[in-house]
């Protein structure tokens, strides 16, 4: 899988879209996970509704939401009140049993808010990820500010 880069601004919302073949993945729940290491686990952040027919309903875990357009074949993840530590390598997944197929690899880049004059040195910055081929950049920056919640903490 190639990796798609989505750029967001700290404090704002970022929408990530993962297109897929709706027929091939018919009846499958979807998930959004964070790659914790090069060969390490991809930790589940949030998944779609337990009932596939209700996948269109937005589900939240902390500041991350997921919704699935099962007919159109587009999984949408929203990261609200984006923080520097939200940066990283993620995967959109299609679930079947205990297995998961990767729909898309996503690199989230978090840029400092140009209108925020706080000292950038007080922010935290994230990192990078395994070698990706020809990453495509999508400037997917939403200006609508939502009330922030505590970012999802990784656990092993």
């Amino acid at each position: 899988h190639n990796t798609t880069v989505f750029q967001g601004v700290a404090g704002q919302s970022l929408q990530v879209s993962c297109p897929y073949d709706s027929m091939k993945h018919w009846g499958r729940r979807k998930a959004w996970c964070r790659q914790l290491g090069e060969k390490g686990p991809c930790q589940r952040v949030v998944s779609t509704h337990n009932l596939w027919l209700l996948s269109f309903l937005r589900r939240w875990n902390g500041s991350t939401a997921i919704t699935d357009d099962t007919l159109g074949g587009t999984l949408t993840i929203t990261l609200r009140n984006l923080q520097p530590h939200d940066a990283g390598l993620y995967q959109c997944q299609s679930l079947h049993g205990s297995e998961a197929d990767t729909l898309r690899k996503v690199l989230v880049e978090v840029l400092a808010d140009p209108l925020d004059h706080r000292d950038a040195g007080d922010l935290w910055f994230p990192g990078e990820s395994e070698s990706f081929e020809d990453a495509h950049v999508e400037h997917s920056i939403s200006r609508s500010l939502l009330e922030g919640e505590i970012p999802f903490p990784p656990t092993s």
Epitope: G37, G40, G88, L111, A112, L123, W124, S129, S131, F132
Partner: antibody, heavy 119, light 107 residues
Framework: EVQLLESGGGLVQPGGSLRLSCAAS????????MAWVRQAPGKGLEWVSS????????YYADSVKGRFTISRDNSKNTLYLQMNSLRAEDTAVYYC????????????WGQGTLVTVSS | DIQMTQSPSSLSASVGDRVTITCKAS??????LAWYQQKPGKAPKLLIY???NRFTGVPSRFSGSGSGTDFTLTISSLQPEDFATYYC?????????FGQGTKLEIK
């Protein structure tokens, strides 16, 4: 194989300037945040500066803010650290590091380049 | 800022020994901890990330555990190449701070 090769270190007088470079290979450089970490002689590790994969945002430790500038040239797979107004306490081995996805740990390190600030 | 304190500062052990190095955070850091190994004149190498995940190529004799404020790095059976200095590091949230290091020497 991931490789990071620093250069540009040396002896400089207090108040002087130096520019460090780090040539990266073995991975898609433009997809990674990068950072500089330093180690004073006989001391522990100290994070110095980082920047995002596009170079769109930069971050600095308080100890170097306003004096050091981190940058990158993704077309050349190279990371830089411009160091101005150098002080004796900046004397250290400077390591170029690659950072793993949003987690703040450094998975690959260069061999380091020594910067000595002395009159 | 959260401080990371390692103990002991130095440790003498023999090949084959089981060794434990501890790292204490001044506040709860969850499982957001990494460990590095550094040999004299060399760059540090990542050993463990997120408390317990071994990095690529790291031997299984190295293991990490803990959560909250107390963490340990264990070497189950010391090998000659393991004599080095070990650093813990708080990760994921700012600021990135390292412990002062634990020097593991041959007895």
């Amino acid at each position: 194989e991931v490789q990071l090769l620093e250069s540009g270190g040396g002896l400089v007088q207090p108040g002087g300037s130096l520019r460090l470079s780090c040539a990266a290979s073995g991975f898609t450089f433009s997809n990674y945040y990068m950072a500089w970490v330093r180690q004073a002689p006989g001391k522990g590790l100290e994070w110095v500066s980082s920047l995002t994969n596009s170079g769109g945002s930069t971050y600095y430790a308080d100890s170097v803010k306003g004096r050091f500038t981190i940058s990158r040239d993704n077309s050349k797979n190279t990371l830089y650290l411009q160091m101005n107004s150098l002080r004796a306490e900046d004397t250290a081995v400077y390591y170029c590091t690659r950072e793993w996805a949003g987690s703040g740990y450094f998975d690959y390190w260069g061999q380091g380049t020594l910067v000595t600030v002395s009159s | 800022d959260i401080q990371m304190t390692q103990s002991p500062s130095s440790l003498s052990a023999s090949v084959g020994d089981r060794v434990t190095i501890t790292c204490k955070a001044s506040q709860n850091v969850g499982n957001n901890l990494a460990w590095y190994q550094q040999k004299p004149g060399k760059a540090p190498k990542l050993l463990i990330y997120y408390t317990s995940n071994r990095f690529t190529g790291v031997p299984s004799r190295f293991s990490g555990s803990g959560s909250g404020t107390d963490f340990t790095l264990t070497i189950s059976s010391l090998q000659p190449e393991d004599f080095a200095t070990y650093y813990c590091q708080r990760i994921y949230n700012s600021p990135w701070t390292f412990g002062q290091g634990t020097k593991l020497e041959i007895k």
